[in-house]
């Protein structure tokens, strides 16, 4: 659980109790079982621009 009173993690990141900080969801590529990856899976991905009209 994130400590009460702390700012929520920014979009594309998730709280890690193991590390006691917000972690970039891209890091789940290196270690998919990291504790913060559960939060990344639950959140929708950041929007992206289509490469075609």
């Amino acid at each position: 659980e994130q400590a009460p009173g702390t700012a929520p993690c920014s979009r594309g990141s998730s709280w890690s109790a193991d590390l006691d900080k917000c972690m970039d969801c891209a890091s789940c590529r290196a270690r998919p079982h990291s504790d913060f990856c559960l939060g990344c899976a639950a959140a929708p991905p950041a929007p992206f621009r289509l490469l075609w009209p």
Epitope: A17, D18, L19, D20, M23, D24, A26, S27, C28, R29, A30, R31, P32, H33, S34
Partner: antibody
């Protein structure tokens, strides 16, 4: 450069305990996991557990729960593994290894190993 | 726990010739992100293990391009295109999909 330097070889009697150290340098100690791996004589590699040094949170293999205790001292950038109630089957080389958590995968770094011999 | 099984356990090789080692996992190492979490390590005599290949096919920093990894799901292969004398040692496959971290039994590569 990243370095993990382990303590020297130990000879212990059955029933005793031993504490192996792993001193890290060349990176921010609290940003990476330290894992511990056992290699019995002539055998393969066996994961014991790992610790997040910044928070002290630990994960253990079921086989080593109650046998190994992992701790870390952030003031000296040193991780420790204590093995209790030693038996002959605990005779092995024990390695510490830094494991990455980050997207920019920069590989694992291993200590040189510490030989623990349990003999009466 | 994921069980990793290697073959062969012993591999006599001739310098300059190719060699390959197989590794099978008891469950798929292919994550929903389309990455195979299979790793290869080499432990040279009297040394610590060193990472050769991560995520099935990516060479670790400083690893010669004669080493390559391939496969998918549960079946993986490490290939050495031309074996050199310095390649002797025990090769281990391992996964990084979940805890516990498990390794294959090891394949001992030695010069004929």
């Amino acid at each position: 450069q990243v370095q993990l330097v382990q303590s020297g070889a130990e000879v212990k009697k059955p029933g005793a305990s031993v504490k192996v150290s792993c001193k890290a340098s060349g990176y921010t100690f609290t940003d990476f996991i330290i894992a511990w791996v056992k290699q019995a004589p002539g055998q393969g590699l066996e994961w014991i557990g790992e610790i997040y040094p910044g928070t002290g949170r630990t994960y253990y293999s079921e086989k080593f729960r109650g046998k190994a205790t992992l701790t870390a001292d952030t003031s000296t950038s040193t991780a420790y593994m204590e093995l209790s109630s030693l038996r002959s089957e605990d005779t092995a080389v024990y390695f510490c290894a830094r494991r990455t958590i980050y997207y920019d995968y920069d590989g694992d770094y291993w200590g040189q190993g510490t030989l623990v011999t349990v003999s009466s | 726990d994921i069980v990793m099984t290697q073959s062969p356990l012993s591999l006599p090789v001739t310098p300059g010739e190719p060699a390959s080692i197989s590794c099978r996992s008891s469950q798929s190492l292919l994550h929903s992100n389309w990455i195979n979490y299979l790793y290869w390590y080499l432990q040279k005599p009297g040394q610590s293990p060193q990472l050769l290949i991560y995520q099935m096919s990516n060479r670790a920093s400083g690893v010669p391009d004669r080493f390559s990894g391939s496969g998918s799901g549960t079946d993986f292969t490490l290939k050495i295109s031309r074996v050199e004398a310095e390649d002797v040692g025990v090769y281990y496959c391992a996964h990084n999909l979940e805890l516990p971290w498990t390794f294959g039994q090891g394949t001992k590569v030695e010069i004929k």
